[in-house]
């Protein structure tokens, strides 16, 4: 029908506003994995903006599958909706506001400001150049104004963006919308080594934050989590060769706070940082 | 409708030194990342340097690392390529793009020619 | 960074199909963008994010991407789709790159 035919018409015009999700499995393509199993799941397509069906093998692929259409659209559309009106009318901060500080895992030395929830603040810390979360600024005016409270206590409006009622995006209308394509979620090399479910013994590495080594372990073949590598090389240089290395070098800032767990989180920025 | 135009180029000898310039409007300049793409008399494209929307992050092929530096003008609406010790190599058509999803280039100025001869 | 493999050249017949590779390592595992270049013009996205095709591109362009391939094709082949022909793609941590281009004659 004609409405059908106005939201297509959107979706692939390619002056789509800049578009900005919480996590960055988000923006991963499909990957239906090396097994052959038939199993119907859902992803988000991050050109479409919609989360649709792809099928899936049963084993390994990444994080941008979910069971269900509505997994998905929770996850990875953020309601849009409902989170800016929230955020304008009620004043309230956006989630990420309260994400900690996250320098990322490549190694450049980016001058950046995060609000600081424990001294209610904005504060310079050091960002390596990708990944990272979205607590991350590039001017200490564009954090307050997004995430620090105004004089009388309210959130300050600087959102300056106004809500798509096709296709649930936002638009830009200020320079206060960070950029274009920086998706923003959990990574992987803090988490323990996973087995998985099945019964095969594969020789795989995990990066163990603790230690910031490599280790090896067996992989049962299927399921686990994505802290699993088929080599030592690939380990170290997906964890520790930004992250661990860059913290043994000082190149984090110190805060006030204490941080009970420095927390890697995957980025694709529209930024390209190389790994140097 | 979205516009790119780009000036500056030239003839410029080894060494020396040029200023590109890309001048945008229909868009929200401010919101997005932009590029320089090169290519190269009857070779194909090279992608050059890119820019943060507020530009404080930049990145440069391994090529020109070092020698020429990108920034931008928001209040302008424009964006520069500062090339500096210039060599033959560096002979090419200058194109600055918008960018996208990385990798993906949806608008593209119509490019300035810059050539290094002595 | 990742290395991208196109064909230097393409030739069909006018209302065939034409069809150009761009191959790269584990390329399904990322999104392959297509640009339309004409001589002394600028490069035109008429391919993104594998089979996606912005507005204004007809629909007799589409994409895929599998395996090691990403493919644009051209259906129903017009005179005026003469051009060379660049893939596009980015791989985590690395800069974006491009193929080095096919050449299509519309015979």
């Known amino acids: 029908d004609s409405e059908e035919d106005e939201e297509h018409t959107i979706i692939t015009d390619t002056e789509l506003p800049p578009l900005k999700l919480m996590h960055s499995f988000c923006a991963f393509k499909a990957d239906d994995g090396p097994c052959k199993a038939i199993m119907k799941r859902f992803f988000f397509n991050i050109f479409t903006r919609q989360c649709e069906e792809f099928i899936y093998g049963g084993c390994e692929g990444n994080q941008n599958r979910f069971e269900s259409l509505e997994e998905c659209k929770k996850m990875c559309t953020r309601d849009n909706a409902n989170r800016i009106i929230k955020t304008t009318l009620q004043q309230e901060k956006p989630d990420f506001c309260f994400l900690e500080e996250d320098p990322g895992i490549c190694r450049g030395y980016i001058t950046r400001y995060f609000y600081n929830n424990q001294t209610k603040q904005c504060e310079r810390f050091k960002y390596g150049g990708c990944l990272g979360n979205m607590n991350n600024f590039e001017t200490l005016e564009e954090c307050k104004n997004i995430c620090e409270d105004g004089p009388n206590g309210f959130q300050v409006d600087n959102y300056g963006t106004q809500l798509n009622a096709v296709n649930n995006s936002l638009t830009p209308q200020s320079t206060k919308v960070p950029s274009l394509f920086e998706f923003h979620g959990p990574s992987w090399c803090l988490t323990p080594a996973d087995r998985g479910l099945c019964r095969a013994n594969e020789n795989r590495f995990y990066y163990n934050s603790v230690i910031g080594k490599c280790r090896p372990f067996k992989y049962s073949g299927c399921g686990g989590n994505e802290n699993n590598f088929t080599s030592k090389q690939e380990c170290l240089r997906a964890c520790k060769k930004g992250f661990i290395q860059r913290i043994s070098k000082g190149g984090l800032i110190k805060t006030k706070r204490k941080r009970k767990k420095q927390r890697v989180k995957i980025a694709y920025e529209e930024i390209f940082v190389k790994n140097m | 409708q979205v516009q790119l135009v780009e000036s500056g180029g030239g003839l410029v000898q080894p060494g020396g030194s040029l200023r590109l310039s890309c001048a945008a409007s229909?868009?929200?300049?401010?919101?997005?990342?932009m590029h320089w793409v090169r290519q190269a008399p009857g070779k194909g494209l090279e992608w050059v340097s890119n820019?943060?929307?507020?530009?404080?992050?930049?990145n440069y092929a391994d090529s020109v690392k070092g020698r020429f530096t990108i920034s931008r003008d928001n209040s302008k609406n424009t964006l520069y390529l500062q090339m500096n010790s210039l060599r033959a190599e560096d002979t090419a058509v200058y194109y600055c793009?918008?960018?996208?999803?990385?990798?993906?280039?949806?608008?593209w100025g119509q490019g300035t020619l810059v050539t290094v001869s002595s | 960074d990742i290395e991208l493999t196109q064909p230097a050249s393409v030739s069909v017949a006018p209302g065939q199909t034409a069809r150009i590779s761009c191959s790269g390592d584990?390329?399904?595992?990322?999104?392959a963008h297509w640009y339309q270049q004409k001589p002394g013009q600028a490069p035109v996205l008429v391919i993104y994010?594998?089979?996606n095709r912005p507005s204004g591109i007809p629909e007799r362009f589409s994409g895929s991407n599998s395996g090691n391939t990403a493919t644009l094709t051209i259906s129903g082949t017009q005179a005026e789709d003469e051009a060379d022909y660049y893939c596009?793609?980015?791989?985590?941590?690395?800069?974006?790159?491009f193929g080095g281009g096919t050449k299509l004659t519309v015979l």
């Open positions: 793009a918008r960018g996208l999803f990385p990798g993906y280039f949806d608008y």
């Open positions: 229909g868009f929200t300049f401010s919101s997005y990342g």
């Open positions: 820019i943060s929307y507020m530009g404080s992050n930049t």
């Open positions: 584990n390329l399904r595992s990322k999104y």
């Open positions: 994010g594998d089979n």
């Open positions: 596009s793609a980015y791989a985590m941590g690395s800069s974006p790159v």
